[in-house]
C-alpha cells in the first residue's frame, strides 16, 4: 500500500477519505486505527456502527468521527480540532471476521495555523456560544508519498 498524506491546519477539522471497492467489501464494517511505530500494531481509534446497515451514521470517539458510504465505497474520517499530537501514520481498515484489511495508509500532517499569533500575545478563544468548528472551513490537502519517502523518521 502506498501512503497518502493528508495535511490539516492546527485547530481546524481535517477530513480523510478512503475509497474502496464497495462490491468486495460488501457487508464489512470499517475502522480507523493509528500505527504505533513502523512495525508496531495499529491501535483502533474508532469503528463504524456495529450494524453494517447503519454504517452511514457518524460515530465519534473523542474528536475523531467515522462514517461509511457503503454503496459509493468511501470511508470518511473527520479529525476535529486538529492538534500537533494528531500527526502520524494511520490506516483505514475493512473488518473481516478477526482480520482487518488495509484500505489505505494515511500520513496525517499538522500545519501551524497561520492566523495563530500566540507569539504576539493576542490569543483568541471562541466564546461559549461560538462553535470553533464553524469558524473554519473543513480543509485537507492530500498527496501520495514519493518513492523513497518514509512516513516515520529513522530512529537513532
Amino acid at each position: 500500500h502506498n501512503t497518502t498524506v493528508f495535511q490539516g491546519v492546527a485547530g481546524q477539522s481535517l477530513q480523510v477519505s478512503c475509497p474502496y471497492d464497495s462490491m468486495k467489501h460488501w457487508g464489512r464494517r470499517k475502522a480507523w486505527c493509528r500505527q504505533l511505530g513502523e512495525k508496531g500494531p495499529c491501535q483502533r481509534v474508532v469503528s463504524t456502527h456495529n450494524l453494517w446497515l447503519l454504517s452511514f451514521l457518524r460515530r465519534w470517539n473523542g474528536s475523531t468521527a467515522i462514517t461509511d458510504d457503503t454503496l459509493g465505497g468511501t470511508l470518511t474520517i473527520t479529525l476535529r480540532n486538529l492538534q500537533p499530537h494528531d500527526a502520524g501514520l494511520y490506516q483505514c481498515q475493512s473488518l473481516h471476521g478477526s482480520e482487518a484489511d488495509t484500505l489505505r495508509k494515511v500520513l496525517v500532517e499538522v500545519l501551524a495555523d497561520p492566523l495563530d499569533h500566540r507569539d504576539a500575545g493576542d490569543l483568541w478563544f471562541p466564546g461559549e456560544s461560538e462553535s470553533f468548528e464553524d469558524a473554519h472551513v473543513e480543509h485537507s490537502i492530500s498527496r501520495s508519498l514519493l518513492e523513497g519517502e518514509i512516513p516515520f523518521p529513522p530512529t537513532s
Partner: antibody, heavy 119, light 106 residues
Framework: QVQLQESGPGLVKPSGTLSLTCAVS?????????WSWVRQPPGKGLEWIGE???????NYNPSLKSRVTISVDKSKNQFSLKLSSVTAADTAVYYC????????????WGQGTTVTVSS | DIQMTQSPSSLSASVGDRVTITCQAS??????LNWYQQKPGKAPKLLIY???NLATGVPSRFSGSGSGTDFTFTISSLQPEDIATYYC????????FGGGTKVEIK
C-alpha cells in the same frame, strides 16, 4: 452473456472430500462480482455455501466454514469448491452462481450438478 | 445468522389469480432482499433484486415490495408457466434463503 458450468465427480465416499469446479464463459472472473456456491439437498431448500472474489478473498457459511475451501484460478477463468469430511447429509445438487449483491443479485447460475455421498 | 421466514410454504391458485407470498427477516435488512423462481429440475432464476427491482427479461406481472423486516412478492395474474417454488434471500450478511413457497395451479 456470462454462463456458468459446474463439473466434478457425482459420487463421493463418506469422510472423503467433495471437489467441484465452475467454469465461467462469456465474461471474466475478474469482473466486479462474488462467485458463489449454493446447494440444495433432495426435496429441500437452498443453502449458501460460500463465495470468492477475483482476488481470492472469501466468505463462508459459518455452519460449513470448518470444512469448506473455495479457490479461484484466473488463468482458467474458473473457481472451485472443496468440502471435506462429507457425510450423507452433504448429498445435494450443487450450483455455482454469480452474485452482484446490491447491483443485481445472484443473476447467473450454472445448471447444477448432483453429488451423492455414499459408499 | 439472519433467518428468513417465508409463508405460506405452499399455495394453490387458479390461472389469472393474484398470488402473494410474504417473507420476514429476523432483523432489519433494509431493501437487501432478492426473490428467485425455481422450476423442478432447474436452477433458480432471479426475478426481483433489491426488494422491488425487476430483473432483466422478467415479465411485469411479477413484483416485489417491502423494506426493513417485512417483504411481499406478488404475481398479479398467475400463468401456467409460473408453477414453481419461489424463494426470498437476504444478502446483508452471509446470504440466507427463505424456506420456499411452492405454487400450484388449482
Amino acid at each position: 452473456q456470462v454462463q456458468l458450468q459446474e463439473s466434478g465427480p457425482g459420487l463421493v465416499k463418506p469422510s472423503g472430500t467433495l471437489s467441484l469446479t465452475c467454469a465461467v464463459s462469456g465474461g471474466s472472473i475478474s469482473d466486479s462480482a462474488w462467485w458463489s456456491w449454493v446447494r440444495q439437498p433432495p426435496g429441500k431448500g437452498l443453502e449458501w455455501i460460500g463465495e470468492i472474489y477475483h482476488d481470492a478473498d472469501t466468505n463462508y457459511n459459518p455452519s460449513l466454514k470448518s470444512r469448506v475451501t473455495i479457490s479461484v484460478d484466473k488463468s482458467k477463468n474458473q473457481f472451485s469448491l472443496k468440502l471435506s469430511s462429507v457425510t450423507a447429509a452433504d448429498t445435494a445438487v450443487y450450483y455455482c452462481a454469480r452474485d452482484t449483491k446490491y447491483w443485481g443479485g445472484m443473476d447467473v447460475w450454472g445448471q447444477g450438478t448432483t453429488v451423492t455421498v455414499s459408499s | 445468522d439472519i433467518q428468513m421466514t417465508q409463508s405460506p410454504s405452499s399455495l394453490s391458485a387458479s390461472v389469472g389469480d393474484r398470488v402473494t407470498i410474504t417473507c420476514q427477516a429476523s432483523q432489519d435488512i433494509s431493501n437487501y432482499l432478492n426473490w428467485y423462481q425455481q422450476k423442478p429440475g432447474k436452477a433458480p432464476k432471479l426475478l426481483i433484486y433489491d426488494a422491488s427491482n425487476l430483473a432483466t427479461g422478467v415479465p411485469s406481472r411479477f413484483s416485489g415490495s417491502g423494506s426493513g423486516t417485512d417483504f411481499t412478492f406478488t404475481i398479479s395474474s398467475l400463468q401456467p408457466e409460473d408453477i414453481a417454488t419461489y424463494y426470498c434471500q437476504q444478502y446483508v450478511e452471509a446470504p440466507t434463503f427463505g424456506g420456499g413457497t411452492k405454487v400450484e395451479i388449482k
